[in-house]
């Protein structure tokens, strides 16, 4: 009886189970009862990641420098090229098809996590006792100056955007 289902790494064609082509190869011709499936390696610049019966391999992804992209990992016959973004930029999606500039954290916010090639800057509001007076993609919230350790007193309270202003203590006459 002709098979209705085939084993793993096989496919059904003309009532026959044929071997799939292994990763890194493409199909040239289906098996017959006298010859096995004929496969050929993918050409340079192409890949196939799975056991397959495709007559064409897939083109490696192009990391377009005009979009701020560069090659993070060169593709092989079995894997696609992995792109990442140039310094100061990050991917707009998981597929990393284009890049945008890293976000800066506004005054009153500090950098919680510095951006990578694939993730944007994560900002956090400066809590009480901390401030940030710049727009930056790197600066964390800084602690207010401790006037006491300088034998000074607070003349102007700090905010999330400004440091405290210290001044000399009033002399007792």
């Amino acid at each position: 009886e002709p098979p209705t289902a085939c084993r793993e790494k096989q496919y059904l064609i003309n009532s026959q189970c044929c071997s799939l082509c292994q990763p890194g190869q493409k199909l040239v011709s289906d098996c017959t009862e006298f010859t096995e499936t004929e496969c050929l390696p993918c050409d340079s610049g192409e890949f196939s990641a799975q056991w397959n019966r495709e007559i064409r391999c897939h083109q490696h992804k192009y990391c377009d420098p005009n979009l701020g992209l560069r090659v993070q990992q060169k593709g092989t016959s079995e894997t696609d090229t992995i792109c990442t973004c140039e310094e100061g930029w990050h991917c707009t999606s998981e597929a990393c098809e284009s890049c945008v500039l890293h976000r800066s954290c506004s005054p009153g916010f500090g950098v919680k996590q510095i951006a990578t090639g694939v993730s944007d800057t994560i900002c956090e509001p400066c809590p009480v006792g901390f401030f940030s007076n710049v727009s930056s993609a790197f600066e964390k919230c800084h602690p207010w100056t401790s006037c006491e350790t300088k034998d000074l007193v607070v003349q102007q309270a700090g905010t999330n955007k400004t440091d405290v202003v210290c001044g000399p203590q009033d002399r007792l006459r």
Epitope: P2, S15, S29, T32, E33, F34, T35, E36, E38
Partner: antibody
Framework: EVQLLESGGGLVQPGGSLRLSCAAS????????MSWVRQAPGKGLEWVSG????????SYADSVKGRFTISRDNSKNTLYLQMNSLRAEDTAVYYC??????????WGQGTLVTVSS | DIQMTQSPSSLSASVGDHVTITCRAS??????LNWYQQKPGKAPKLLIY???SLQSGVPSRFSGSGSGTDFTLTISSLQPEDFATYYC?????????FGQGTKLEIK
Amino acid sequence: EVQLLESGGGLVQPGGSLRLSCAASGFTFSSYAMSWVRQAPGKGLEWVSGIGGSSSYTSYADSVKGRFTISRDNSKNTLYLQMNSLRAEDTAVYYCARYYSYHMDYWGQGTLVTVSS
Amino acid sequence: DIQMTQSPSSLSASVGDHVTITCRASQSISSYLNWYQQKPGKAPKLLIYAASSLQSGVPSRFSGSGSGTDFTLTISSLQPEDFATYYCQQYGSAPPTFGQGTKLEIK
């Protein structure tokens, strides 16, 4: 016991025709692909043609394509090779063989075809 | 068609010898190769299939190896009944094709 018995060989003139038969026994004939392989005197083996178990698939060597036809009658457990427009270079011993998973595991004893004027 | 080239074409050896016959394909055929033995006036007999699998009933002194384009048939200790002609046959691409044969003779 698997047995394959060829018949139908003989002397034929160039341009003539001949039909070879291969009687099979000892196995479920319809479940197996079959083939014909030939061997010219003092030469090596040449795969000539093959046919699937259900007759749905046939294949031929380029040297015989358009001249030879393979067929089978599963009700009679018999394989055939119809040879037309025979040439001197078709002179050979013709073997029928059973196919099992891409290899020929049983062979007949062969039948000699001589094409000569 | 894929060309199969066997070497040597003929070989003289003695009983007890270790013998290696090679078969080269004109393009990669993975492990899709069979070996047959033929004695004069007889039909071929299957020895090895899928490059290295021993056919049932064939003595274990016969072994096959290789993949891609280069294959070998090895007889570990020649016996008198092993003197014959050996053929490789590929099934990686249609049509199946045989090597030209290697004749193994008594020295």
